[in-house]
Each structure stands twice: as structure tokens, then as C-alpha cells.
């Protein structure tokens, strides 16, 4: 075969947002018949030559960026896309509110505001049922999340997290849920 082997996939189960002391499994998936997997934590000297890493209790220093690759014969694959494993519950939960209120008419405007007692500069908004918040970079890094021209699709349960840019994979506990109701 010419060229590198195709990259494997790397996922965190049940989620890449992991509360402290809760379990998570990292799984590297390549094609059938792989000779060797290598799963590594970036910016660290640690790696393992296995496809699955079971973390029975999430710890702060296990948060960060992971990637994996595999070997067939003497050929190594391209590395997987990076997986960002986030530890949640490291800090107290922020509060989430809606301005002017959590009930909004279709076509109206609403702003979701995340507030923390820490001097954190980073926030993530998460709508139940959506992908994890870091899959939506446009939603990062602001305490205020304006939603212009609300539609029925914006209805749902929202939570926010706060964190520091100094330790971007150590997040607060989630805020209490905010139910956004779109009427009309």
C-alpha cells in the first residue's frame, strides 16, 4: 500500500464531558486486523499500546487532548482527530438566566447569560440533545449568548459551564437547567 494508513476514530464513552470521579472510556477504532494501537495524551509523556483506556474515576490531570494511531506491519496510520476530554465539576456551578425572560415569542430576541463568582473568562452553552458545547466554537468564550430571531427550534433545556483559559479542560459543574419556551 502506498501512502499512510487511514486515520482511526477516537471517542469518549459515554461523553467527553466527564464529571470528576465518574468513569469514562476512551476507544480508538481502526480497521479490522490492526496489529497495534497507540493511544496518547498530548503534552504529556504518557501513552499506552492498547485501543481502549478505561478511566474508572475522572481526575483533573486526565483532562486534556488525546489522539491515537495504529500500526499494521511497519506502517503507522495517520493520527486520529484530537479528542478533547473535559473534567467537569472542578469549580462551583455558574448561574444561567434569560433576558428578558425564559418565555419568548417566535421571531423575538433573547439573551442567555452565564454568570460565575470566579473571575473566569470562558463560558460554554449546552443545549440538551445537541453535540457537546466544544463542537460549537462560535458558542465559546462569552458570558452572553444572544439568540436573534428565535424559532421553535430554540426551545429546550440549556445549561452553561464556566472555565479559565489557563486550564481550558477543567470546567465548572453545569448550571441549573434553564427551560427556554418559544411561544406562538
Amino acid at each position: 500500500q502506498s501512502g499512510p494508513l487511514p486515520k482511526p476514530s477516537l471517542q469518549a464513552l459515554p461523553s467527553s464531558l466527564v464529571p470528576l470521579e465518574k468513569p469514562v472510556t476512551l476507544r480508538c477504532q481502526g480497521p479490522p486486523g490492526v496489529d497495534l494501537y497507540r493511544l496518547e495524551k498530548l503534552s504529556s509523556s504518557r501513552y499506552q499500546d492498547q485501543a481502549v483506556l478505561f478511566i474508572p474515576a475522572m481526575k483533573r490531570s486526565l483532562a486534556g487532548r488525546y489522539r491515537c494511531s495504529y500500526q499494521n506491519g511497519s506502517l503507522w496510520s495517520l493520527p486520529s482527530d484530537q479528542l478533547e476530554l473535559v473534567a467537569t465539576g472542578v469549580f462551583a456551578k455558574p448561574s444561567l438566566s434569560a433576558q428578558p425572560g425564559p418565555a419568548v415569542s417566535s421571531g423575538g430576541d433573547v439573551t442567555l447569560q452565564c454568570q460565575t463568582r470566579y473571575g473566569f473568562d470562558q463560558f460554554a452553552l449546552y443545549k440538551e440533545g445537541d453535540p457537546a458545547p466544544y463542537k460549537n466554537p462560535e458558542r465559546w468564550y462569552r458570558a452572553s449568548f444572544p439568540i436573534i430571531t428565535v424559532t421553535a427550534a430554540h426551545s429546550g433545556t440549556y445549561r452553561c459551564y464556566s472555565f479559565s483559559s489557563r486550564d481550558p479542560y477543567l470546567w465548572s459543574a453545569p448550571s441549573d437547567p434553564l427551560e427556554l419556551v418559544v411561544t406562538g
Epitope: P56, A57, K59, R60, S61, V90, F163, S165, D167
Partner: antibody
Amino acid sequence: EVKLQESGGGLVQPGRSLKLSCTASGFTFSDYFMSWVRQAPTRGLEWVASISSGGASAYWRDSVKGRFTISRDNAKSALYLQMDSLRSEDTATYFCARGELDFDYWGQGVMVAVSS
Amino acid sequence: ADPNSTLLSASVGDRVTLNCTASQNVYKNLAWYQQKLGEAPRLLLYSANSQTGIPSRFSGSGSGPDFTLTISSLQPEDVASYFCQQYYSGNTFGAGTKLELK
């Protein structure tokens, strides 16, 4: 070569304060959690405190909570342990160590003696 | 030395086994350290059996509450104290085993 060097130990009276420092070299300091671990002849090895790589998160063993503060200066590759309201049971050799869970590099240690 | 530590005597070339039992299931969240007199501890193994660039005569096994550090052929330079440490629930060290030559 990874090196950790502690300083600031000494003999101090109960209730007084002491600040330990640890200077790191040979690795990218800002990539790693750092910790303090102590060793007393009567109590063996005890984890004291840890701090995250960026310094936003820090935590301590219950017996030193509210008295000890761990901090770091990544620009100087330095780790600190501010020890206030010292007690005789804090007497030990204090080690600076790299990591939060297991500790893959250690300094040589600095002696802290709390006695009247 | 810690008054709760144990003493083990063995001869050069012996296969030496050190045991560590945690008070609960700690999965594989266990490390082993070697500490020579007047020196800092040195990490030998983490995650129960992952090596750190140490001599191949050192190996680790176990999972749950019961773990073992094995030295396949004892050398004079292995005279030291050995500690296990669990980091599943908090972070605690065992009292240690002082290994000496017969």
C-alpha cells in the same frame, strides 16, 4: 534532564509561617500538574497539595486546608507552598513532585521543623 | 522510618515479591516507588504495571485491591524502601517495605 529543586525550609515556631519554593527545569513546566508531598519518620509519605498546569485549580489534604496555599508561576517555572499557622505535626521533609496522581519526578526535599 | 513499615531480607539473585493491598477496589490506579536512604522516592511503575524506564527485572501486577511488585533477580543496588500508592480515591501511600540483603 528533569530537575526539581526545593528551597525555603527551616526551623520555625508553632503558629508561624514559612514559604517553600521549587524551581523546575528540563521540561515544559506549564504542561504539568505539580504537587507537594511530605515525609515524616512517624507518618510516612503524605500527599499535601496539587495544582493544575495553568494554576486555575488547586486542592489540599484536609489537615492543611485553610493553612497551606499552593501556587505556581509558569513564567518562572516555579512552584510554591505557603504554610501558615504551622503545627508540630507539619514537621517533615517536603518534596516538590511532578504530577497529580502518580509522581514521576521528585526534588531532593527540604526539611521543615516546627518546634518551640 | 515509618514504624508501620515492614522489613524483608533477601539474597542477591533472589526473586522478591512485595505485596500491597488497598482498602477498596482501586482498579489499576496504583503506583510503586523506590526510595534509597537519603534520597527522594523514584517512580518505578504506574497504573499497576506500566514501566517508567526502569530495569526490566522490576514488574508489577494486580488489579482491584491486591497488587504485587516483583524483582525477578535481586541486585545489591535494589536495597531500598518500596512504597505503593493508590490514587483512585484521594491519594495515599502505603507504609512501605524496607528491603535488605541477607
